[in-house]
C-alpha cells in the first residue's frame, strides 16, 4: 500500500482542516489508515482522524482544531496499521479556504431598491471577521445569458442595488461567496442561493 | 465579544489555599488554551500556568508542585488550585485567552499572602 | 529558561518624539512567538504587536515592531498621550514555555 498522491489541506481558519489524497489502488480508507495530526506546541496533544473514502483510490479526513492563529504549524502522520506512510506538515494560515456565508435575504420592500444581506461566517474575535470580502451572483431562472456578478468590497454583508438593473416580472435567484486577501485563501463554497420575483414600476415617460 | 471575569481572590495566611476561577464567555472555550498570569505590586509579569484544549498542563518552576490549573467546558470556566501559599505568590492574577501570545484578558483578581 | 532583557527600564520622552524600545534574548526566539504588550496603571495589559511585527486588532499603525533572533525593537513613531505606560515584551518557547521582559517604562518628560 502506497500513497499516489500526497494529502493536500486546507483550514476554515476556525476550527476545521480537510485534507485529501490518494492511495495507488482501491482503499477501504475508514478500516485501513488513520492521520494522526498534532499542533506543535506545549500544551497540544496527538489526535487521531479516521478518513472517508472520496472515490476509488481518494481518501478524504476532517481534522477538528483548536481556534486558528498565524504562527500554528501541525504534524501529520499517514498510518496503514503499523506502517507509517507519509509524514508532513501543515501550516493553517498558509492554506485557506474560508467558510461559506449564511442566511442571504433578500429585502424588496424598500423602494425600487433590492437590498441583499447575509451573515459574517466568522465570529468577531476570529481574525477573518474583519478580512472578508464577497462576490454576490445573480441570475435569472428565466434566461441563462442574464447572469451578473457584483464585488463587494467593503466590510458591510450587503449589497444595494436598483431594482431596475434587472428585468421586471421575472424570478432571479442569488448567491454570495467569500474570500480574504490578507490571507490570499481561496474563495469559499457559495452560500445556498435564494429566490425573488423581481417587480418594479416603470417610470412614466415623458413626452 | 470575548469576556474573561476573575473571581477567588482574596486574603491568605502563609501555607494557606485559595482556589481562583475564571468565566469566560464570547468565544468558543473548548478550542482554547487558557493561562494564568500573575502580577506582583509594583513589579512585572509573570506567566503561572497554562492547560490546553485536551487538559495537558504547564507550570512555571515557581509554582510547581504547589499550584494546580483545570478547566470545565461544559460550565466555560478555568480554575487555579493554590496550596502552600507563600508571602511571594502575593500578586493580581490574570487569566488569559491565547496561545504563543496572549490577545485576551481578565481585569484579575488580587491574592494576598500575608499573617 | 529564556531570560529576556527590555531596555532601558525607563524612557522619559515628550508628546510626538519618537519611542525605540529593546528586548533581548538569552538565546534565539522564533519572531513567530515574541509579542509586545502596553500596561497603564490599574489596567490589564494590552496586546500590541504579535509575530514580532504584525499589529493585534485595533492598535493604531504608530506602533510597529521589528527584530529576529535575539534582538527586538518595539518603536512608536510619534508618542501620543495615551501611549505613556509600561511595556513589556514576551516569547514562547516550545520546551520552556512563556516568559516576559520585566518591562520599559515610557514616561512623560
Known amino acids: 500500500m502506497k500513497v499516489l498522491q500526497e494529502p493536500t489541506c486546507v483550514s476554515d481558519y476556525m476550527s476545521i482542516s480537510t485534507c485529501e489524497w490518494k492511495m495507488n489502488g482501491p482503499t477501504n480508507c475508514s478500516t485501513e489508515l488513520r492521520l494522526l495530526y498534532q499542533l506543535v506546541f506545549l500544551l497540544s496533544e496527538a489526535h487521531t482522524c479516521i478518513p472517508e473514502n472520496n472515490g476509488g483510490a481518494g481518501c478524504v479526513c476532517h481534522l477538528l482544531m483548536d481556534d486558528v492563529v498565524s504562527a500554528d504549524n501541525y504534524t501529520l502522520d499517514l498510518w496503514a496499521g503499523q506502517q507509517l506512510l507519509w509524514k508532513g506538515s501543515f501550516k493553517p494560515s498558509e492554506h485557506v479556504k474560508p467558510r461559506a456565508p449564511g442566511n442571504l435575504t433578500v429585502h424588496t420592500n424598500v423602494s425600487d431598491t433590492l437590498l441583499l444581506t447575509w451573515s459574517n461566517p466568522y465570529p468577531p474575535d476570529n481574525y477573518l471577521y474583519n478580512h472578508l470580502t464577497y462576490a454576490v451572483n445573480i441570475w435569472s431562472e428565466n434566461d441563462p445569458a442574464d447572469f451578473r456578478i457584483y464585488n463587494v468590497t467593503y466590510l458591510e454583508p450587503s449589497l444595494r442595488i436598483a431594482a431596475s438593473t434587472l428585468k421586471s416580472g421575472i424570478s432571479y435567484r442569488a448567491r454570495v461567496r467569500a474570500w480574504a486577501q490578507c490571507y490570499n485563501t481561496t474563495w469559499s463554497e457559495w452560500s445556498p442561493s435564494t429566490k425573488w420575483h423581481n417587480s418594479y414600476r416603470e417610470p412614466f415617460e415623458q413626452h | 465579544e470575548v469576556q474573561l471575569v476573575e473571581s477567588g481572590g482574596g486574603l491568605v495566611h502563609p501555607g494557606g489555599s485559595l482556589r481562583l476561577s475564571c468565566a469566560a464567555s464570547?468565544?468558543?472555550?473548548?478550542?482554547?488554551?487558557m493561562f494564568w498570569v500573575r502580577q506582583a505590586p509594583g513589579k512585572g509579569l509573570e506567566w503561572v500556568s497554562g492547560i490546553g484544549t485536551g487538559g495537558a498542563t504547564s507550570y512555571a518552576d515557581s509554582v510547581k508542585g504547589r499550584f494546580t490549573i483545570s478547566r470545565d467546558n461544559a460550565k466555560n470556566s478555568l480554575y487555579l488550585q493554590m496550596n502552600s501559599l507563600r508571602a511571594e505568590d502575593t500578586a493580581v492574577y490574570y487569566c488569559a485567552r491565547g496561545r504563543y501570545y496572549f490577545p485576551w484578558w481578565g481585569q484579575g483578581t488580587l491574592v494576598t499572602v500575608s499573617s | 529558561e529564556i531570560v529576556l532583557t527590555q531596555s532601558p527600564g525607563t524612557l522619559s520622552l515628550s508628546p510626538g518624539e519618537r519611542a525605540t524600545l529593546s528586548c533581548r534574548a538569552s538565546q534565539s526566539v522564533s519572531s513567530s512567538y515574541l509579542a509586545w504588550y502596553q500596561q497603564k496603571p490599574g489596567q490589564a495589559p494590552r496586546l500590541l504587536i504579535y509575530g514580532a511585527s504584525s499589529r493585534a486588532t485595533g492598535i493604531p499603525d504608530r506602533f510597529s515592531g521589528s527584530g529576529s533572533g535575539t534582538d527586538f525593537t518595539l518603536t512608536i513613531s510619534r508618542l501620543e498621550p495615551e501611549d505613556f505606560a509600561v511595556y513589556y515584551c514576551?516569547?514562547?518557547?516550545?520546551?520552556?514555555?512563556?516568559?516576559f521582559g520585566q518591562g520599559t517604562k515610557v514616561e512623560i518628560k
Open positions: 514576551q516569547q514562547y518557547d516550545h520546551s520552556a514555555g512563556w516568559t
Open positions: 464570547g468565544f468558543t472555550f473548548s478550542r482554547n488554551a
